[in-house]
């Protein structure tokens, strides 16, 4: 194929791949008609003047995972057709000015996972057609004003995993076509008002894993097209009342791992398209009425690992489309009988690791589609008669690690469990805690005659109330959740992020695979 170097493989489709530790310089001669060249996992340490001079038809050039630390300014001369250039995973500390001069067709430039200490406006001033710029995983401490001013067509910019401590409010001002901006895993403590004002087409903004303490009230007010906003693992202690007010397209919002103590009224709304709201690992202590009432399409609400001790009866008003509700690992002792009445489409509820002593008999009355209920590790001694009877789709019920009181009052629950044993799972079964003579025995097979008779007065007859709700719009079902594989955090759908950890630690999480996006 017009001469293929011995240390490379060349395909009919004009693709050349050169790999191996024995390669210490760009192989020659390269086929003149090559359109794609990959130089991977070699010991090349520098690129000299014009090593690609004879392959001017090249469209894609990947020089990745090498020992590359030095590039001559004219290294990419004569590559006017080049659209994709990756220098990722090398050891570059400095980029020569003019390195990308003449690359008039360049659309994607990947400089991630190097050791770059700084970038300057002159570096990218010739790249007027650039659409994607990856700079994550470097050692950048600041971005000078003007660095991206010529990249007016840029749609994706990744600055994650650097050492940025502050951002100038002017640095993104000319990027009106930007759709994805990633600033995750830096050291940002605050973001000046106006920083994102020019980003009118932004769809994803990743700010997670910084040290942001305060959000300016109008920080996102110009980002009407924003769909995904990641603010997790920061130091945010309060949310300004209007901070999310102008985000009608938002469908995923992560706020987990912050220091939120309360959710101020009206904070989430109106967000008619929000599907997922992640609030675990904060310091929230109570949920007032209507706190989520603007989120009519919400399907996943994660409130686990907070300090919630009180939920107002109308806290979940408006959440008619909710499928997943995670409240585990909080400080709940009581639940009002009306608290879940609006959650007609709920499929999974996690209430484990709380301090619940009893449940209202009608707590799940309106929630006919429940498939999984996690109630393990609470203070439950018994459950009301018929609490699960109407839940025909229930296939997972976790009741272990509760102090079940196995007197004669437990018989109705014991009988129901006998008939529904497969739903309890095989890992851990509920066992009696009292009386002492049956402690540790399985609740399902216990001989209640051995236990102490009940001294409890039977409950007064109950009369169900007729519910009356204000008119609320109904929406078609959009997802179905059946799996209960759990995740530590939402997968923030990054093509260039390779460190997502998945776990199946049910005792800690209580979230399902459907939440992985």
């Amino acid at each position: 194929y017009h001469g293929c170097p011995s240390e490379c493989t060349c395909s009919r489709a004009s693709q050349v791949e050169c790999t191996g530790a024995r390669i210490v310089a760009v192989p020659t001669p390269l086929p003149w008609n090559a359109m794609s060249l990959q130089i991977l996992n070699t010991h090349i340490t520098e690129l000299n003047e014009s090593p690609f001079l004879n392959i001017s038809a090249l469209i894609a050039l990947r020089i990745e995972k090498n020992e590359l630390s030095r590039i001559t300014p004219g290294a990419f001369r004569n590559l006017g057709s080049l659209r994709y250039l990756s220098l990722a995973n090398n050891k570059l500390q400095v980029l020569p000015i003019g390195l990308f001069q003449g690359l008039d067709s360049l659309e994607s430039l990947l400089l991630s996972s190097n050791q770059l200490l700084q970038i300057q406006p002159a570096h990218f001033s010739q790249c007027s057609n650039l659409k994607e710029l990856q700079l994550h995983g470097n050692h950048l401490e600041y971005i000078p004003d003007g660095a991206f001013d010529h990249l007016v067509g840029l749609t994706k910019l990744n600055l994650g995993k650097n050492s940025l401590t502050h951002i100038s409010p002017r640095v993104f001002q000319h990027l009106g076509n930007l759709q994805v901006l990633r600033l995750y895993e830096n050291r940002l403590t605050d973001i000046p008002m106006g920083t994102f004002d020019g980003l009118v087409n932004l769809q994803e903004l990743a700010l997670q894993q910084n040290q942001i303490g305060l959000l300016s009230p109008g920080l996102f007010h110009n980002n009407h097209n924003l769909q995904r906003l990641y603010l997790s693992n920061n130091h945010i202690s309060q949310l300004p009342p209007s901070v999310f007010m102008q985000l009608p397209q938002l469908n995923r919002l992560t706020l987990f791992g912050n220091s939120l103590k309360e959710l101020s009224p009206g904070i989430f709304g109106p967000m008619p398209n929000l599907r997922e709201l992640w609030l675990y690992d904060n310091h929230i202590s109570s949920l007032p009425d209507n706190v989520f009432s603007n989120l009519r399409q919400l399907q996943v609400l994660i409130l686990s690992r907070n300090q919630i001790s009180f939920i107002s009866p109308g806290a979940f008003n408006g959440l008619t489309e909710l499928r997943e509700l995670s409240l585990h690992t909080n400080a709940l002792q009581d639940l009002d009988g009306n608290v879940f009445r609006m959650l007609a489409n709920l499929q999974n509820i996690s209430l484990q690791n709380n301090r619940l002593r009893q449940l209202p008999g009608n707590i799940f009355a309106n929630v006919n589609g429940l498939m999984a209920i996690q109630l393990q590790n609470n203070q439950l001694e018994n459950l009301p008669l018929g609490i699960f009877d109407h839940l025909g789709k229930l296939c997972e019920l976790r009741l272990y690690d509760n102090p079940w009181r196995c007197d004669s009052d437990i018989l109705p629950l014991r009988n129901w469990l006998l008939l529904n044993q497969p739903r309890l799972g095989t890992d851990t079964v509920p066992v009696c805690f009292s009386p002492a003579n049956v402690r540790g025995q399985s609740l399902i097979i216990i001989n209640v005659n051995v236990a102490v008779p009940s001294v409890h007065v039977p409950e007064v007859p109950s009369y169900p109330e007729t519910p009356w709700y204000p008119d609320t719009p109904s929406y078609p079902d959009t997802t179905s959740v059946s799996s209960t594989t759990e995740l530590t955090s939402p997968v923030e759908d990054y093509t260039d992020l390779t460190t997502i950890q998945v776990t199946d630690d049910r005792s800690v999480w209580g979230m399902t695979q459907a939440q992985s996006g």
């Epitope: 009425d289 209507n290 009866p313 109308g314 009002d336 209202p360 009369y463 709700y469």
Partner: antibody, heavy 118, light 107 residues
Framework: QVQLVQSGAEVKKPGASVKVSCKAS????????INWVRQAPGQGLEWMGW????????KYAQKFQGRVTMTRDTSTSTVYMELSSLRSEDTAVYYC???????????WGQGTLVTVSS | DIQMTQSPSSLSASVGDRVTITCKAS??????VAWYQQKPGKAPKLLIY???YRSSGVPSRFSGSGSGTDFTLTISSLQPEDFATYYC?????????FGGGTKVEIK
């Protein structure tokens, strides 16, 4: 239907205690929070706190902390509000009230007048 | 504590009049405001919850509006049985607090 029936009027001396009862019917007593609200003669309404009958857990307004005790008897579906160290400004009608589908008071008792006078 | 300031404290009106009562919260309470009607010697009666939703059985002449800090109760056409005292209440945060009341009297 939901009903809350309170005990009758009381006259107490300053420094004494009063215990007002509220008997619930028409619903499962243990499943819903019950609140106490008071109203001094010719004055507005003042929230005192709540009790969750299922567990006996309580939350009191700071103003009444240390002087008010809310209890329940599940066998009779009755909650009690005891106010100690009475003073003349505690003269009021005391209402028990149950939340509906939110933390607003949908169901009210008829009220109990407590008069504190020497 | 959140203060609820109601105005006017009293008003005189005639049957058929349109009556507006306002309530101002000292901080943002979202839509967590209820309105009650109380007649002498009786317990309060819930009229409006979540700022604008009428309670079951309440006539349509009663309406509520507002969010954040400013709320309004409107009686579109006053009826003889509407002469009473009206209270607003916030239930955003503890302690739950009431307005001072508005007494609607016959002119």
């Amino acid at each position: 239907q939901v009903q809350l029936v309170q005990s009758g009027a009381e006259v107490k001396k300053p420094g004494a205690s009063v215990k007002v009862s509220c008997k619930a019917s028409g619903y499962t007593f243990t499943d819903y929070y019950i609140n106490w609200v008071r109203q001094a003669p010719g004055q507005g309404l003042e929230w005192m706190g709540w009790i969750y009958p299922g567990s006996g857990n309580t939350k009191y307004a700071q103003k009444f902390q240390g002087r008010v005790t809310m209890t329940r008897d599940t066998s009779t579906s009755t909650v009690y509000m005891e106010l100690s160290s009475l003073r003349s400004e505690d003269t009021a009608v005391y209402y028990c009230a149950r939340w509906g589908y939110g933390a607003y008071f949908t169901y009210w008792g008829q009220g109990t007048l407590v008069t504190v006078s020497s | 504590d959140i203060q609820m300031t109601q105005s006017p404290s009293s008003l005189s009106a005639s049957v058929g009049d349109r009556v507006t009562i306002t309530c101002k919260a000292s901080q943002n309470v979202g839509i967590n405001v209820a309105w009650y009607q109380q007649k002498p010697g009786k317990a309060p009666k819930l009229l409006i919850y979540s700022a604008s939703y009428r309670s079951s059985g309440v006539p349509s002449r009663f309406s509520g509006s507002g969010s954040g800090t400013d709320f309004t109760l409107t009686i579109s056409s006053l009826q003889p049985e509407d002469f009473a005292t009206y209270y607003c209440q916030q239930y955003q945060s503890f302690p739950y607090t009431f307005g001072g009341g508005t007494k609607v009297e016959i002119k």
